[in-house]
């Protein structure tokens, strides 16, 4: 159906509330430095304009594209040049170049301070005083910190946030009610952001085919009763949705996501037996529920994979007649039979299968050549299995903090050129894989761990791309999406690294360390560990363990002292001197 006015179409489809929320998110993701009030004003103006176009589609400017309307609105911001520098040059361009220019200026690491919640009473007062403004502020603060956040999912989280306050602001002990609920939501939001950033990177750096392959594997595991045609349909629609959101087309993305949810619910008989509960919910919850739905049971009588993909005499003919469909079918069949494998592993197996067919179908006797192809998968399967086993054992021995430190040492030695805050952030997140996955049953560990690692390593790649300092990091990040994790795992100590000059300032601590929350205390200690390694990259694990032990004791001692600052300034230099001597 052709619409005279695209903006009216989206306003009608999405409804005023969701429309306004998505516009606010879009502007906050593009202009990350602007104050909340400016964005509220812009979003209000765009929503009023859309409402007018919905009432009269042939009104002035209603026929303009969304990019034109949004871009024109962004370019009216007076402080554009002061706040964003060369981003203001985007406004000299015409669409679609102008939008591409805005996208290129999105900052994955804007460096805003972490969100600190005011007192519960103040929060509840703000919530009750103006709910819409309160939730708008939430959308704004998340969106500007996470410029690739999946917008329709952010609307869902805002709804959850609203629910938490509606409940807890009535509670006798507001703080006790809010604390754990807000923290649990925060964890979900951070993971959601990282997952979508990975999807956007897949699309932007490796193209539709990579994203589709990833989605075929994931959805085939989740919906093993669906046939390949059904999986292909959902994957094609899902790819469009994520391309739109990653490209800043948030209204189209949210609208198409709602359409996909509708399609899945109308066709649940041919997709999965697990969708029923999701399909009774309103649109935001429905889409979220479908995205998180549990895996369906495997059909009982699946034939052996070998019949179609090895033993069939016409494998090469079938492959050559429609390569992508044949490989897609292979990936689908393999994935639905192996819910315990990570998506990354399944994609490596499909890649190996493709390489084998490319090689064998060019020989005189293809069947003999590819006869053992499924057996040749064993080392590819063993590698992540062994990695997960070894690292979970280490995690169980050391606990989360100790495991993070082991990873900090490991990754600093692999890529010492990478900035200390990035190494600390990424290693802390890599360490969380233990907490998240190692307690799971054996059948879920690999899938949980490796796919989570892919998401975290993507964060490293995204941050490193902004300021590239290590050729080996660039190589691991850009050569192959599915081999990123094995590439990083395979990196040894960087022998070319020239140790950093010693800087006493880096190892100077103050009494304010004592009042920090535990997590921030850990970050300070881990920052010191990385700096120590950059200064002494040849330090052994034993030496590091000793120095870190001494450091912990020093912090504990000075934080218990009467004159904390005096203790830090007196004992600190002694500790540094002892550490330097120990690491000679």
């Amino acid at each position: 159906e052709a619409y005279k006015s695209e903006i009216a179409h989206r306003y009608n489809d999405l409804g005023e509330e969701h429309f306004r929320g998505l516009v606010l998110v879009a502007f906050s993701q593009y202009l990350q430095q602007c104050p909340f009030e400016d964005h509220v004003k812009l979003a209000k103006e765009v929503t009023e304009f859309a409402k007018a176009c919905a009432a009269e589609e042939s009104g002035a400017n209603c026929d303009k594209s969304l990019h034109t309307l949004f871009g024109d609105k962004l370019c009216t911001v007076a402080s554009l040049r002061d706040k964003y520098g060369d981003m203001a040059d985007c406004c000299e361009k015409q669409e679609p170049d102008r939008n591409e220019c805005f996208l290129a200026h999105k900052d994955d690491n804007p460096g805003f301070p972490p969100l600190v919640a005011p007192e519960p009473d103040a929060l509840c007062a703000a919530f009750q005083d103006n709910e819409q403004l309160f939730l708008g502020k939430y959308l704004y603060e998340i969106a500007r910190r996470h410029p690739y956040f999946y917008a329709p999912e952010l609307l869902y989280y805002a709804q959850q946030y609203k629910g938490v306050f509606a409940e807890c602001c009535q509670a006798a002990d507001k703080a006790a009610c809010l604390g754990p609920k807000i923290e649990a939501l925060r964890e979900k939001v951070l993971l959601s952001s990282a997952k979508e950033r990975f999807k956007c990177a897949s699309l932007q750096k490796f193209g539709d085919r990579a994203f589709k392959a990833w989605s075929v594997a994931r959805l085939s595991q989740r919906f093993p009763k669906a046939d390949f045609a059904e999986i292909s349909k959902v994957v094609t629609d899902l790819t469009k949705v994520h391309k739109e959101c990653c490209h800043g087309d948030l209204l189209e993305c949210a609208d198409d996501r709602a359409d996909l949810a509708k399609y899945m619910c109308e066709n649940q008989d041919s997709i999965s037996t697990k969708l029923k509960e999701c399909c009774d919910k309103p649109v935001l919850e429905k889409s979220q529920c479908l995205a998180e739905v549990e895996r369906d049971e495997l059909p009982g009588d699946l034939p052996s994979l070998a019949a179609d993909f090895v033993e069939d005499k016409e494998v090469c003919k079938n492959y050559q007649e429609a390569k992508d469909v044949f490989l897609g079918t292979f990936l689908y069949e393999y994935a639905r039979r192996h819910p315990e494998y990570s998506v990354s592993l399944l994609l490596r197996l499909a890649k190996e299968y493709e390489a084998t067919l490319e090689k064998c179908c060019a020989t005189d006797d293809p069947p003999t050549c590819y006869a053992k192809v499924l057996d040749e998968f064993k080392p590819l399967v063993d590698e992540p299995q062994n990695l997960v086993k070894t690292n979970c054992e280490l995690f169980e021995k050391l606990g989360e903090y100790g495991f993070q430190n082991a990873l900090l040492v490991r990754y600093t030695k692999k890529a010492p050129q990478v900035s200390t805050p990035t190494l600390v952030e990424v290693s802390r997140k890599l360490g969380k894989v233990g907490t998240k996955c190692c307690k799971k049953p054996e059948s879920e560990r690999m899938s949980c761990a490796e796919d989570f690692l892919s998401v975290v390593l993507n964060r490293l790649c995204v941050l490193h791309e902004k300021t590239p300092v290590s050729e080996r990091v660039t190589k691991c990040c850009s050569e192959s999406l599915v081999n990123r994790r094995p590439c990083f795992s395979g990196l040894e100590v960087d022998e070319t690294y020239v140790p950093k000059e010693f800087n006493a300032e880096t190892f100077t601590f103050h009494a304010d360390l004592c009042t920090l929350p535990e997590a921030e205390k850990q970050v300070k200690k881990q920052t010191a560990l990385v700096e120590l390694l950059k200064h002494k990259p040849k330090a052994t694990d034993e030496q590091l363990k000793t120095v870190m032990g001494d450091f912990g004791a020093f912090v504990e001692k000075c934080c218990a002292a009467e004159n904390k600052e005096g203790c830090f300034s007196e004992e600190g230099p002694k500790l540094v001197a002892a550490a330097q001597a120990a690491l000679v």
Partner: nanobody, 118 residues
Framework: EVQLLESGGGLVQPGGSLRLSCTAS????????MGWVRQAPGKGLEWVSW????????YYADSVKGRFTISRDNSKNTLYLQMNSLRAEDTAVYYC???????????WGQGTLVTVSS
């Protein structure tokens, strides 16, 4: 190249039956969802029925539910449509279609005409 050859159409009285067949070649039949699409005089294309590659799941348009039965024989690369209790409104050209993705088809045959009239 992909070929789909329908047969079995013809003139039949209301309430009568017909069995359409479609022989496929040029692609791996057992890997694809297959279906029947029809076009009544002066109307658009309409999915009548489809069947999964392994035959375990079938779909029927509401207008033919309970009267038509789709089946396939992967060893013979053949698709069937058993049509019972035929009505005048079933008059159409019936096309056998290969589907690589739900809701779409990339190849279809020449079609076979089914006329239901007394």
């Amino acid at each position: 190249e992909v070929q789909l050859l329908e047969s079995g159409g013809g003139l039949v009285q209301p309430g009568g039956s017909l069995r359409l067949s479609c022989t496929a070649s040029g692609f791996t039949f057992r890997h694809y969802r297959m279906g029947w699409v029809r076009q009544a005089p002066g109307k658009g294309l309409e999915w009548v029925s489809w069947i999964r590659p392994d035959g375990t799941f079938t779909y029927y348009a509401d207008s033919v539910k309970g009267r038509f039965t789709i089946s396939r024989d992967n060893s013979k690369n053949t698709l069937y449509l058993q049509m019972n209790s035929l009505r005048a409104e079933d008059t159409a050209v019936y096309y056998c279609a290969k589907s690589y993705m739900a809701g779409t088809f990339d190849y279809w045959g020449q079609g076979t005409l089914v006329t239901v009239s007394s």
